[in-house]
Interface confidence: low
């Protein structure tokens, strides 16, 4: 019989219900925005905004300072007071819409939903390793701002994204705001604008450049700005918006908008559609070719990538890549395929595609019928003409006007659908050693830290743990402070180490010591931990073998048994070849001689499942007693593997030595032609791995084997005669003298 060790699912080597407690701060209200600051003199801070309040925390998440930012019109509003005696506008709560650092000063800038979306500048004052905010400056000049032209009206109550860029001695705020007709009519925030902060901190310079959704489209065409970032020579905004100005406004897609970070101009404003799909390896019938589209971006982050992922993306290590989590629709509800997918867009390729799109629009000969696009911002036109103009005049350039690139950038889910039901709500990507890790927050308040790699059919987890007991969604914005990431969920801010919260979720020594080097995991006798958790017994050097099962569970006291041991950390080499003398197996007092691997039985084991098998021949010693005993595997002097060496002993109970007894055989005669069905009765007849009934030295073909009975069909006899009949178990004869009589047919 060919018994095989049962597969152990890969998931059995880890436990994601292990509780980790990470430092946290209760903000007293739903966290609306969060940003971190690290100074060059070891001072650092976390700024956390809730409705009507701004908290300043130290690097240990302890409160350092708190500032009232609302309600507007309330005498206790500390930021409002910076604008002089009021009233400055209708009273109401202040929801923080923008919280950014101006690195040039350095200063914190906060903008809220009240007071026409104006901003406040808070200079940073280092005090030891903590930071305090100086008295706020009101970035609003009453005489410069009118309802139809308001350079100091920055934040939209519907959402605003800001990236601050230093150009020369000035700070430029790249601002993108969601608008509707009501918001647009009230102090005219713009969709996209570049505003220079005035040197005297009295507001923003008038005459700024901007693009806005045209009034006729404001009702039906809304743009959500999901993320903004600055890398290289450009600032990028990521949007979710209707795919068409004219068609169904609920048919959404994702775009990347690119603006120059070196020139405060919008002539080279470019948009590119980002297309993220789930393309399963085996396509279901009826599934769309090219994969199932996930058109709606939920969260994004750009980061340089490690060597391994860079190779897979065919780019150089350290190059910047935009990662996005996409869903099928606004509700992100379930459909066929996973709830969330992650796509990677190398920035170099984004830029190249955009540049090619400009060439297609502006280089002769231009493809006929190619539209400039962005009809929600500007008058429709065909390339190479500027918006609304019939043709180029000699002193205008095709390249100096906004453009939607005619081709989209298509990518497939890096995780191959393996996120399954998980709804990702936050994303931050870091490079650790040569590994790229996605730190993801989820709808149910968990943190998943997963290696970003596309070639596998399972997820490589650094960790997967619950942030707290509330189960509230993790919010979109994540900040980094040193070696920690700050996630917000409900009214709490949590500080999560980028190396993972610990190692206790790895349940086996092998999984523990195979963990990434940056996690600092070691084995502590019976658990996985970091050195500070068990300094006495902590080691990263070796793992004992681990026996999980063996077969058979019993064997004859006389005769041999082929024993198959199952478990892990037997070999460390897929071939299962073991050097001479490294593996000792004993069953009770008796040695079990290692057998060479039968190469015909070697099966590739997918890493999703793991099991190792070891076979040995058990020949009991004369002193071995009948009854239950232990199986023991000791491994010594093994050469080290990639992660550790195998060294130690594993013991498993449950093997029994038995003495087979033959009590009766019938019938005792049959035809010379053979084929008589013999029944042998006794005890312990099924022990071990081999048995044979011999009639005159020829095997009687076994039809059934049980503990108390064997059935076999007699072989043909040479002559009519009485011949010896014997039973061998494990190659040794069972005591007793029996004969079988061949008679004429």
């Amino acid at each position: 019989e060919d018994w095989q060790c049962p597969r152990t699912p890969y998931a059995a080597s880890r436990d994601f219900d292990v509780k980790y407690v990470v430092p946290s701060f209760s903000a007293g209200g739903l966290v609306q925005a969060m940003v971190t600051y690290e100074g060059d003199r070891n001072e650092s801070a976390v700024f956390v905004a809730i409705r009507n309040r701004l908290h300043v925390l130290g690097p240990d998440l302890k409160s350092v300072q708190s500032l009232a930012t609302g309600p507007a019109g309330d005498p206790g509003c500390q930021t409002c007071a910076a604008c002089g005696p009021g009233p400055h506008g209708p009273p109401g709560d202040t929801d923080t819409k923008v919280l950014v650092l101006d690195p040039a000063l350095p200063a914190l800038v906060s903008c809220g939903s009240s007071l026409q979306g104006r901003c406040f500048l808070h200079d940073l004052e280092p005090q030891g390793t903590a930071v305090h905010l100086a008295a706020p400056a009101c970035l609003f000049s009453a005489h410069h701002n009118r309802p139809d032209d308001c350079p100091d009206c920055v934040a939209s109550p519907l959402g605003t994204r800001v990236t601050v860029v230093e150009q020369g001695q000035a700070s430029y705020f790249y601002v993108a705001s969601s608008l509707d007709a009501a918001v647009a009519a009230s102090f005219s925030p713009r969709s996209v604008s570049i505003r220079r902060l005035k040197a005297d901190a009295s507001g923003f310079a008038p005459g700024f450049v901007a693009l806005s959704v045209l009034p006729k489209h404001l009702v039906s065409y809304s743009i959500e700005y999901v993320h903004s970032f600055h890398t290289g020579a450009f600032v990028y905004f990521l949007t979710v918006q209707p795919a068409s100005v004219t068609d169904d406004p609920s048919a959404l897609h994702t775009r990347l908008a690119r603006l120059s970070a070196t020139e405060p101009e919008l002539g080279d404003y470019r948009e590119l559609v980002l297309d993220c799909r789930f393309a399963p390896k085996r396509r279901r019938r009826g599934a769309p070719e090219g994969g199932q589209p996930y058109p709606v971006l939920r969260v994004a982050h750009s980061a340089p990538v490690g060597a391994q992922l860079a190779t897979e993306l065919s780019i150089a290590e350290g190059q910047e890549v935009l990662f996005g989590v996409f869903v099928t629709g606004k509700d992100g509800g379930p459909g066929v395929g996973p709830n969330s997918v992650v796509c990677a867009f190398p920035i170099d390729l984004l830029d190249t595609l955009i540049d090619e799109g400009v060439e297609r629009c502006c280089e002769s000969p231009v493809h006929p019928g190619l539209r400039r696009g962005l009809d929600f911002f500007q008058s429709p036109s065909f390339c190479p003409n500027p918006p609304g103009l019939e043709a180029l005049s000699p002193n205008t350039s095709c390249r100096h006007f906004p453009l939607l690139v005619s081709s989209s950038f298509s990518r497939v889910d890096l995780f191959n659908g393996l996120l399954g039901p998980v709804q990702v709500t936050a994303l931050y990507v870091t490079r650790l050693d040569n590994v790229t890790v996605a730190h993801m927050g989820t709808m149910d308040g968990r943190i998943l830290q997963v290696e970003l790699v596309r070639s596998l059919n399972y997820l490589l987890y650094v960790s997967n743990f619950s942030l707290g007991d509330s189960g509230q969604p993790v919010q979109r914005d994540v900040s980094r402070l040193g070696d920690h990431l700050l996630f917000a969920s409900g009214d709490q801010v949590f500080q999560v180490p980028i190396q993972g919260p610990g190692c206790r979720h790895f349940l086996t020594c092998g999984r523990c010591l195979r963990a990434w080097h940056f996690m600092g995991c070691g084995w502590c006798g019976n658990m996985c931990g970091q050195q500070k958790e068990c300094p006495g017994s902590w080691q990263q050097d070796h793992c004992p073998p681990k026996l999980t099962e063996f077969h058979p569970h019993s064997g004859p006291l006389r005769g041999s048994t082929r024993l198959t041991l199952c478990g892990s950390n037997f070999y460390l080499h897929p071939s299962g070849l073991v050097p001479e003398g490294t593996h000792q197996v004993t069953v009770g007092q008796s040695p079990c001689r290692p057998l060479p691997k039968d190469s015909s039985k070697l099966r590739p084991v997918p890493r999703k499942d793991f099991v190792e098998e070891f076979e040995c021949e058990l020949e009991p010693l004369g002193t071995q007693a009948v009854g239950p005993t232990n199986v023991s595997l000791t491994v010594t002097n093994m050469p080290p593997g990639k992660h550790f060496r195998v060294d130690g002993t594993s013991v498993l109970r449950g093997f029994s030595f038995m003495e087979p007894v033959l009590i009766a055989v019938q019938p005792l005669f049959g035809p010379r032609a053979g084929g008589t069905c013999l029944t042998l009765e006794g005890q312990s007849l099924s022990v071990g791995t081999s048995r044979a009934v011999l009639v005159n030295g020829t095997e009687c073909l076994l039809a059934r084997v049980s503990e108390g009975q064997l059935l076999c069909a007699t072989p043909p006899g040479a002559t009519v005669a009485s011949v010896p009949l014997s039973l061998q178990v494990g190659g040794a004869q069972v005591p007793g003298s029996w004969t079988f009589q061949y008679r004429e047919d």
Partner: antibody, heavy 123, light 112 residues
Framework: DVQLQESGPGLVKPSQSLSLTCTVT?????????WNWIRQFPGNKLEWMGY???????SYNPSLKSRFSITRDTSKNQFFLQLNSVTTEDSATYYC????????????????WGQGTLVTVSA | DVVMTQTPLTLSVTIGQPASISCKSS???????????LNWLLQRPGQSPKRLIY???KLDSGVPDRFSGSGSGTDFTLKISRVEAEDLGVYYC?????????FGAGTKLELK
């Protein structure tokens, strides 16, 4: 596997037009690549003639001036070369090839080539 | 147009010996994105050209690792560590940084 196959007349008279077809199997000409024509003159000199990209935009070698164009038929997964006013100087083996991905559709050179078709221009 | 100059035009080799071909461009092939679009192709007798190397040094799948490419800017080299019979044919360099794309005149690798 991607395969390209050129077809067209082997003999063309001077001043006439040369039309060649490239039939692509194993890939769609609307996928993210550029589809090129390259020719090889007697004596082995290779000349890149131009491409049509997956989106239908084209780019031509200026040396061919205005007498060269590339078009396509996406339903048949074919793209075409038309060279007007041919002379004996246009006698060559004509290859179609799949170009690169992203950067100008050419960057990584030509990974897949047809087997080539010999065209002779002669009265 | 960028002129690609290959040397030597003919290279006589012994099987098992190394071989080296040089290609020089009339202007730098470094593109603004930091990549250098220099390719090497081999045309065996009676066959169409086949790409061996792209982006200066990246080997196409199925190309033996006895082939290697190196260089930057305007000077590039193709090396074969040990020539085998199947390596005989004409080698071309191709630049695809600048339009129009241009080929070298070719180097014929033949048996001594």
């Amino acid at each position: 596997d991607v395969q390209l196959q050129e077809s067209g007349p082997g003999l063309v008279k001077p001043s006439q037009s040369l039309s060649l077809t490239c039939t692509v199997t194993g890939d769609s000409i609307t996928s993210d690549y550029a589809w090129n024509w390259i020719r090889q003159f007697p004596g082995n000199k290779l000349e890149w003639m131009g491409y049509i990209s997956y989106s239908g935009s084209t780019s031509y070698n200026p040396s061919l001036k205005s007498r060269f164009s590339i078009t396509r038929d996406t339903s048949k997964n074919q793209f075409f070369l038309q060279l007007n006013s041919v002379t004996t100087e246009d006698s060559a083996t004509y290859y179609c090839a799949r170009g690169g991905f992203y950067y100008r559709y050419a960057g990584p050179g030509f990974a897949y080539w047809g087997q080539g078709t010999l065209v002779t221009v002669s009265a | 147009d960028v002129v690609m100059t290959q040397t030597p035009l003919t290279l006589s080799v012994t099987i098992g010996q190394p071989a080296s071909i040089s290609c020089k461009s009339s202007q730098s092939l470094l593109y603004t994105n930091g990549k250098t679009y220099l390719n090497w192709l081999l045309q065996r007798p009676g066959q169409s050209p086949k790409r061996l190397i792209y982006l200066v040094s990246k080997l196409d799948s199925g190309v033996p690792d006895r082939f290697s490419g190196s260089g930057s800017g305007t000077d590039f080299t193709l090396k074969i560590s040990r020539v085998e019979a199947e390596d005989l044919g004409v080698y071309y360099c191709l630049q695809s940084t600048h339009f129009p794309l241009t080929f070298g005149a070719g180097t014929k690798l033949e048996l001594k």
